[in-house]
Interface confidence: low
């Protein structure tokens, strides 16, 4: 007869490990016990557990609770256990001696290989500005054993770089991502991608980019200048930028204060029935955390007699 | 599959105790940060309190800071929630559920059990 | 805490009509936010995270938009199935908080 066994056994860290041994005999042969043991290079074995055929599975107090026989129906010739709960602690190498009749005794050896699966971080870097030269977005570190692989997925045009630190059972990996800050960014993804053997899926984390800026200020509605005529209603200004943070706005009037009457609503300012008295030169002021902008504009309300008196004085000249 | 049973609720009267248990079965429990969530009769979801994987990070709402502790075994791959000073408002069907497993931020919650009922009263 | 108000609080519709909730937050969350559907007597369950990604086994008929402050929940043609209740969740700070709630039922 001969024995069955895997080469290496690969668990997950907290899973259950199948340590295989299959005495495959001649008719007739039977199994009397299997002894486990660990048997690491340097050290001496270490008995698990006795699976006897008369008196069951005995587990030495080391393993206590942890190691068992695995489901019924149990074959006699299969002497297989299973050990509870993996830890890292228990990667080595196990051996399998099986005692038959009338045969005699078989041993095997096999690799128990615990895969740590990594919990990654992400860490956003500094705040980002538009206008900054190449800035960490975030950096993504994960441990595990085997070292994990760390990636990025994102359309943001960046550059990556990564460092690994060994550690005595495990690895760790960080990978940061660079680039270059711009309003265009804002919102958008950029995933932290972890592989490992450990896992069934990639682990992804996704951390949403924030980037400052403040757009140049402009004001509209000065675009026809012959619609701001003495007694025009409805007149209005707007100021125009944007920016992340939203910003906020404040007009004021550079050769005095906002006549009464003008109502300020955000962006916008609103004029009552137009005089002469409107006529001056306004300042919109945006401002974010990040910058702050001003735009000015000079109105000039025309008086429509004035117009026309001149239009008879220039008639009556000719 | 992740299977996640809650157990514990019952009846209890105004400043007594209880504890929830949430056994988890079918992946890495330990892998992930757990929330218990609650909701009273014909109301809304409203969190209560979260874990993070290896127990190390705890957060409460406000309405439970101080009376309730969430903790977790993850050799038994269990969740708990152990509450006193009990008052008739936290009356609810009670959830455990998991983090969402490729984010390492926030709550949202991808697994959920089928709950277990909480009564308050005297 | 941020508040998240969803409309409308329960609403009518037949089997192949297209539904949309909305959700707003009580201040700027980017796209942290979650939808979950909850049927009576049962545990709720993830349809969108990120705001707009479909969690995996989820019809693709339910969609999730927005960003900031308002988003959507649309059902593009509404089956038997969907008629339960629907809530948004911040996820942006702790603790985390869920909107009203919104009952779609059978016309």
């Known amino acids: 007869g001969e024995l069955e066994t895997s080469d290496v056994v690969t668990v997950v860290l907290g899973q259950d490990a199948k340590l295989p041994c299959f005495y495959r005999g001649d008719s007739g042969e039977q199994v009397g016990q299997v002894a486990w043991a660990r048997v690491d290079a340097g050290e001496g074995a270490q008995e698990l557990a006795l699976l006897h055929s008369k008196y069951g599975l005995h587990v030495s107090p080391a393993y206590e609770g942890r190691v068992e026989q695995p489901p019924p129906p149990r074959n006699p010739l299969d002497g297989s256990v299973l050990l509870r709960n993996a830890v890292q602690a228990d990667e080595g190498e196990y051996e399998c001696r099986v005692s038959t009749f009338p045969a005699g005794s078989f041993q095997a050896r096999l690799r128990l290989r615990v895969l740590v699966p990594p919990l990654p971080s992400l860490n956003p870097g500094p705040a980002l500005e538009e206008g900054q030269g190449l800035t960490l977005a975030a950096s993504c570190t994960a441990e595990g054993s085997p070292a994990p692989s760390v990636t990025w997925d994102t359309e943001v045009k960046g550059t990556t770089s990564s460092r690994s630190f060994k550690h005595s059972r495990s690895a760790a990996v960080t990978s940061e991502f660079h680039l270059v800050p711009s309003r265009s960014m804002n919102g958008q993804p950029l995933t932290c991608v972890v592989s490992h053997p450990g896992l069934l899926q990639d682990q992804r984390i996704t951390h949403i980019l924030h980037v400052s800026f403040l757009a140049e200020a402009s004001v509209r509605g000065l675009e026809d200048q012959n619609l701001w005529h003495i007694g025009r209603e409805g007149a209005m200004l707007k100021c125009l930028s944007e920016g992340q943070p939203p910003p906020s706005y404040n007009w004021t009037r550079l050769d005095g204060p906002l006549p009464s009457g003008v109502r300020v609503d955000g962006d916008t300012l609103g004029f009552p029935p137009l005089t002469t008295e409107h006529s001056g030169i306004y300042v919109c002021h945006v401002s974010n955390e990040f910058s702050s902008r001003d735009s000015q504009v000079t109105v000039d309300v025309l008086d429509p007699q004035e117009d026309s008196g001149k239009q008879v004085d220039l008639v009556s000249a000719s | 599959e992740v299977q996640l049973v809650e157990s514990g609720g019952g009846l209890v009267q105004p400043g007594g105790s209880l504890r929830l248990s949430c056994a988890a079965s079918?992946?890495?429990?330990?892998?992930?940060?757990m929330s218990w969530v609650r909701q009273a009769p014909g109301k809304g979801l409203e969190w209560v309190s979260r874990?993070?994987?290896?127990?190390?990070?705890?957060d409460y709402a406000d309405s439970v800071k101080g009376r309730f502790t969430i903790s977790r075994d993850n050799s038994k791959n269990t969740l708990y929630l152990q509450m006193n000073s009990l008052r008739a408002e936290d009356t609810a069907v009670y959830y455990c559920?998991?983090?969402?497993?490729?984010?390492?931020?926030?709550?949202?919650?991808?697994?959920w059990g089928q709950g277990t009922l909480v009564t308050v009263s005297s | 805490d941020i508040q998240m108000t969803q409309s409308p609080s329960s609403l009518s519709a037949s089997v192949g009509d297209r539904v949309t909730i909305t959700c707003r937050a009580s201040?700027?969350?980017?796209?942290?936010l979650a939808w979950y559907q909850q049927k009576p007597g049962k545990a709720p369950k993830l349809l969108i995270y990120?705001?707009?990604s479909l969690q995996s086994g989820v019809p693709s008929r339910f969609s999730g938009s927005g960003s900031g402050t308002d988003f959507t929940l649309t059902i593009s043609s509404l089956q038997p199935e969907d008629f339960a209740t629907y809530y948004c969740?911040?996820?942006?700070?702790?603790?985390?908080?869920f909107g009203q709630g919104t009952k779609v039922e059978i016309k």
């Open positions: 559920a998991r983090q969402t497993e490729d984010r390492s931020y926030g709550y949202d919650l991808d697994y």
């Open positions: 079918g992946d890495i429990f330990g892998s992930y940060a």
């Open positions: 874990i993070s994987s290896h127990g190390a990070s705890r």
């Open positions: 201040q700027g969350i980017s796209s942290y």
């Open positions: 990120a705001a707009s």
């Open positions: 969740q911040q996820h942006y700070t702790t603790p985390p908080t």
